[in-house]
Interface confidence: medium
């Protein structure tokens, strides 16, 4: 079995304020079992943007149906972008663990920049 890769193909994405930003991420394998999470920033201070397993993220929608069997697309769309949303977003695969899931692999990150809303 090939080793899992987390693919974030875009180095950067630029979106006008008020629009939606699509951040693309795919896994190359279903193994190991465990959830996907999206974070803004890296390290201890990173901000959770989306958790596949639990939580309420009203501005985030998944691009494909994550519950679909064999789905490998974990792209998200964030609505109503503001300048405060700028930063680097990481798609992170976790391995199912007990009691806590363990971070397994991160994508290379996609930098979101926000342009002023066209007047």
């Amino acid at each position: 079995e090939d080793e899992l890769q987390v693919i974030q193909p875009e180095k950067s994405v630029s979106v006008a304020a008020g629009e939606s930003a699509t951040l693309r991420c795919a896994m190359t394998s279903l193994i190991p079992v465990g959830p996907i999470m999206w974070f803004r920033g890296a390290g201890a201070g990173r901000e959770l943007i989306y958790n596949q397993k639990e939580g309420h993220f009203p501005r985030v929608t998944t691009v494909s149906e994550l519950t679909k069997r064999n789905n490998l697309d974990f792209s998200i769309s964030i609505s109503n972008i503001t300048p405060a949303d700028a930063g680097t977003y990481y798609c992170v695969k976790f391995r199912k663990g007990s009691p806590d899931d363990v971070e397994f692999k991160s994508g290379a990150g996609t930098e979101l920049s926000v342009r002023a809303k066209p007047s």
Epitope: Q5, I7, P9, R24, T28, A42, L72, D73, K105, G109
Partner: antibody, heavy 120, light 112 residues
Amino acid sequence: QVQLVQSGAEVKKPGSSVKVSCKASGGTFSSYAISWVRQAPGQGLEWMGGIIPIFGTANYAQKFQGRVTITADESTSTAYMELSSLRSEDTAVYYCARGVPRGDLGMDVWGQGTTVTVSS
Amino acid sequence: DIVMTQSPLSLPVTPGEPASISCRSSQSLLHSNGYNYLDWYLQKPGQSPQLLIYLGSNRASGVPDRFSGSGSGTDFTLKISRVEAEDVGVYYCMQAIESPLTFGGGTKVEIK
């Protein structure tokens, strides 16, 4: 183990188009990129573009923009590279390879190559 | 586009002796995640290229341990600790940090 099998050699006239196929077998196809790399006789390697089938959209090296089209058919695990407005300088061996810009593991599987000769 | 420059162009080697190939990039291949997005490939005569090293220093599956990659940022080296006859061919470095992927011009390794 994943294998990439390419279509056979082609001889084309200047100004025409060629479409090369690359069929994957033995592993996941959808979320790996398929890149296309060419090698002119006696020359080095040149990346033309690539596609991640699960996303559908391809990206291309500027040099080939407007002349190359890369597509993928998830149902048959096959990627295609079509190059139009052929000229003699396009005579080369065209390779497909599994690997993606910003992927972790390099282009780890390569097709056997397809020789395209452009001659009047 | 990122420009990749390899040296030497040609490298005559003696079996059993070490060999070293240099690769320079026009901008840093070191990502904030700590990885260098630099791969090494070998194209043996009449064959498709094969992956040797990924992420700067990681040997690909099935690659003998006499091959090693090192370096960071813009300067990278591929070393063969003891060259064998089967190692002849053209070696290419390639940056994988951003599109378009770009290759070095190649280093031809041949037996003296």
